[in-house]
């Protein structure tokens, strides 16, 4: 209808990187940009994804590096992490959330894709990272291992070959674990501390290095309360579990003192694995009972999983597995469960801003049913699993549903700020649900919408649109875009008009009648009023169209609700040559050429376009006649 | 050779002080225990206090807690026995006693014993 | 706290006499007890620790076993100089806490 499609600014990147994959106009003190999202960006080695901001009338578009942003006390991986893949801006304050949906950092042998976003200022710094599903991982740990160096142990080399291989099963890392080794005998040395080295090799490298200091007394109590009030005290971090491992070959020549030390060690949560070295005994034939029930005493509360005793120095190597299992007993999920919570969440798969925060998607949560997070200046909200089960049953579970497909919210009159929430594979058809979310980790489901067609995807793209501008939704349009008619991938956009409280299903928009693929839906825009008659408008991408060059479609808003024929189809053949996916992501909320009319910018494979609005004129024909 | 000598025993009135010392000669007092074991005149053995010399923790008989506290000086190889609030009751031979590993902790030396005597 | 019983409270026998005096733990309690003798006026002595352990310097007439929460301390063949007050102590395992019996007196026929 008025969008120029004669002179459109083809902004070019990265076809590799998926640039335009997302796009978002911004303003910064009347400049304006567009922010373009590229998930497949690389940033040295790794295919990061990144965020570039792009200035509109002419010039490069610069990358913001947000693919460098590192979390501390992690360790991370960024590879193939989809930054850009969302990106929502906040009008408020004209700063933007660019979502890494598949940042992943290391817990063990696992890799836990948590996903993380990065909040970027209105000038384009980074400010914060929004990470609401990380979580510690279950190896936050601080081990101290009291290894007894007096003269009685023989050989040392022994020693030292067990706490090597025991080192090497450690994971040891940002986030994960820290180990320090104090030696004790009369006396009692710190060999190395809890955050002198950072990495397997390191640790090794630093343990091989060991020498036994000797000695001819064996306080063990000595050894272990110095490790509590010391070794764990220098360099150990707040909230990780502590685990103390103690390597001694006789009875303590302090036992009288194990009682308090051990009741100190229990105050302060220090676990306790405790090896008995018989060794000694064995070579003198002597009876170990009393040296076993003082190690049994110091090894935490159940023996049969704190304790172990070994023959002789040399049989230390016989016990590294079944020791190391026993302290990572607690990897993989929490209590042992069979199923994931949060760990391969994948937040930030969308993004939609409120007043008092964001809503980021969570399509991996709860076994990939998904869920919907918040995060506020206050703090996190994360629903429980079973705050879903109204609309998501347990006989379910297994399917998929990938709840926070897509995230946006409504507003009523009667109920305020809901949320929605798409989950496109829901029981095959997919399904839409309107929520609150309230701070006990509980959800009121409103509503729900759902799909009519397997595979169609229905719920994967959700707009809301307030036609009118008086800050109450009039119309939810809901995408399915894979929704099959005609022997094709067609694409569909369901409308549901408020109804008082309840959003009423009043038909879909019409697209074009190719026989090709479209994929109508992808993508679904509430856009400020294009044609200026005062009602807000829509618009609609069709990425697949004319053979995967794309199509974008304007609606427009009138009275209250949403004309259902296009007004106008723009196709990428008609703007530029070579556009490719045209139509995968939509965003118009602001003049960009100070002409005082709302212009669009649109996604396509390896580009940004913006189009610009044309001025409509209104002419008012009258007809009189004279002589009357 | 191991040797402790008891000295600071007296005649001290109820709710008076006193302060006991065990020196050590032959052996570290920080590689062992020092206990306090007192003898009323005609009882038995009752055990007062003990003290970790290296790690100064310390036990006490629920009769002398919060009244008497024991302490060590492994410079000086000495250990103490601060009694206040003292009672009739307290009335005895204080002997220090050595507790350590080699004798499967049991009391190997004693001191000679110093008398205390609380009255008015 | 652990409570060592110690019975008799005195005895009368001769010289040659086989003499048994008992100790009872009021609960289980581990190896960990000795016997003293103690003569008037005198400090105690250490005879038996690790409840049959002989200390050095100690004639082998004295001997000590334990049969679950009894320990027992014979004399086989009392001497004269034999004729004292003997007590049994039970340490606490893993602190020094400890505890005494209430004393045997083996006094002469």
């Known amino acids: 209808f008025n969008m120029d499609t004669r002179k459109p600014r083809v902004i070019p990147g990265s076809r590799t990187a998926f640039f335009g994959y997302t796009v978002q106009q911004h303003d910064i003190s009347g400049n304006k940009w567009l922010v373009v999202g590229a998930p497949l960006e690389t940033n040295g080695y790794q295919k990061t994804g990144d965020v570039y901001k792009c200035p509109v009338i002419h010039g490069n578009c610069t990358k913001l590096n947000l693919g460098r942003v590192t979390l501390s006390n992690v360790s991370e991986r960024k590879d193939n992490m989809r930054l850009g893949l969302s990106l929502a801006t906040n009008p408020k304050d004209n700063s933007f959330l660019a979502c890494s949906p598949l940042w992943s950092h290391e817990c063990g042998s696992s890799y836990y894709t948590t996903g993380m976003c990065s909040r970027v200022n209105s000038n384009f710094r980074f400010s914060k990272t929004v990470a609401p599903a990380l979580q510690r991982c279950q190896t936050y740990m601080d081990i101290v291992i009291v290894l007894d160096g007096s003269n009685s142990i023989y050989p040392w080399v022994e020693v030292q070959h067990f706490l090597i291989n025991i080192l090497k099963k450690f994971y040891i890392g940002p986030g994960q674990i820290q180990v320090g080794v104090v030696q004790y005998g009369e006396d009692v040395v710190h060999e190395f501390h809890l955050n002198d080295y950072r990495s397997v090799k390191d640790v090794v490298e630093a343990a091989s290095h060991i020498e036994q200091r000797g000695g001819t007394e064996t306080r063990t109590a000595f050894g272990i309360e110095f490790a509590r009030s010391e070794a764990f005290q220098k360099g150990g971090r707040k909230g990780a579990k502590k685990v103390m491992i103690v390597i001694t070959d006789g009875e303590s020549h302090d036992s009288p003192d194990l009682e308090k030390v051990i009741q100190q060690s229990e105050r302060d949560n220090v676990t306790r694995y405790a090896v008995a070295v018989l060794g000694y005994y064995n070579r003198r034939g002597i009876n170990p009972e009393t040296f076993l029930n003082e190690i049994k005493y110091i090894a935490s509360d159940p023996d049969d999983k704190h304790f172990f005793n070994v023959t002789d120095e040399a049989a230390l190597k016989d016990i590294v597995d079944a020791l190391g299992d026993r302290i990572f007993s607690l990897e993989g999920t929490n209590k042992n469960e069979t199923s994931f919570g949060l760990e391969m969440s994948q937040t930030g798969f969308s993004s939609h801003v409120v007043e008092d925060g964001v809503l980021l998607g969570a399509v991996g949560a709860y076994d990939w049913n998904g869920a919907v997070l918040k995060e506020t200046s206050a703090g996190k909200v994360i629903p429980l699993r079973e705050s879903y089960l109204k609309e998501f049953p347990e006989e379910l579970k297994n399917h998929g549903a990938y709840l926070g497909y897509t995230v946006t919210s409504v507003v009523s009159s009667r109920q305020g700020r809901v949320y929605v929430a798409g989950a496109p594979r829901f029981n095959h058809t997919g399904k839409v649900i309107l929520f609150t979310m309230h701070n006990n980790r509980s959800l009121t489901i409103h509503q729900a919408m759902r799909g009519q067609q397997i595979g169609s995807y229905f719920g994967s793209e959700i707009t809301s649109v307030d036609i009118d501008g008086d800050g109450v939704t009039d119309v939810l349009l809901v995408g399915a875009p894979m929704y099959f008619n005609e022997g094709r991938e067609r694409g569909k956009v369901y409308v549901y008009e408020l109804r008082q409280n309840l959003f009423v299903y009043n038909g879909t928009l019409k697209d074009s009648h190719s026989y090709q693929n479209a994929r109508f839906g992808s993508s679904i825009a509430s856009v400020r009023d294009l044609n200026q008659d005062s009602y807000n408008d829509v618009v609609v991408g069709a990425p697949l169209e004319d053979n995967h060059a794309g199509a974008i479609y304007i609606f427009h808003g009138f009275r209250g609700s949403i004309l259902k024929t296009p007004k106008q189809r723009i196709t990428a053949s008609e703007l530029a040559t070579g556009l490719q996916y045209f139509g995968c992501s939509i965003h118009g909320q602001l003049d960009l050429n100070e002409d005082g009319l709302i212009d669009l910018a649109v996604g396509a494979l390896g580009n940004a376009v913006i189009l610009w609005s044309r001025p409509v004129v209104q002419i008012n024909a009258s007809l009189h006649f004279e002589p009357s | 050779e191991v040797q402790l000598v008891e000295s600071g025993g007296g005649l001290v009135q109820p709710g008076g002080s006193l302060r006991l010392s065990c020196a050590a000669s032959g052996f570290n007092l920080y590689s062992s225990y020092i206990h306090w074991v007192r003898q009323a005149p005609g009882k038995g053995l009752e055990w007062v206090a003990s003290i970790s010399s290296h790690s100064s923790y310390t036990y006490y008989a629920d009769s002398v807690k919060g009244r008497f506290t024991i302490s060590a000086d492994t410079s000086k190889n000495t250990a103490y026995l601060q009694m206040n609030s003292l009672r009739a009751e307290d009335t005895a031979v204080y002997y220090c006693?050595?507790?350590?590993?080699?004798?499967?902790?049991?009391?190997?030396?004693w001191g000679q014993g110093t008398l205390v005597t609380v009255s008015s | 706290d652990i409570q060592m019983t110690q019975s008799p409270s005195s005895l009368s026998a001769s010289v040659g006499d086989r003499v048994t005096i008992t100790c009872r733990a009021s609960q289980s309690v581990s190896s960990a007890v000795a016997w003293y003798q103690q003569k008037p006026g005198k400090a105690p002595k250490l005879l038996i620790y690790?409840?049959?352990s002989l200390y050095s310097g100690v004639p082998s007439r004295f001997s000590g076993s334990r049969s679950g929460t009894d320990f027992t301390l014979t004399i086989s063949s009392l001497q004269p100089e034999d004729f004292a007050t003997y007590y049994c102590?039970?340490?606490?395992?893993?602190?020094?806490?400890?505890?005494f019996g209430q004393g045997t007196k083996v006094e002469i026929k």
């Open positions: 006693a050595r507790y350590w590993y080699q004798s499967a902790w049991a009391l190997d030396y």
């Open positions: 102590q039970q340490s606490a395992p893993y602190s020094s806490l400890i505890t």
């Open positions: 690790s409840a049959s």
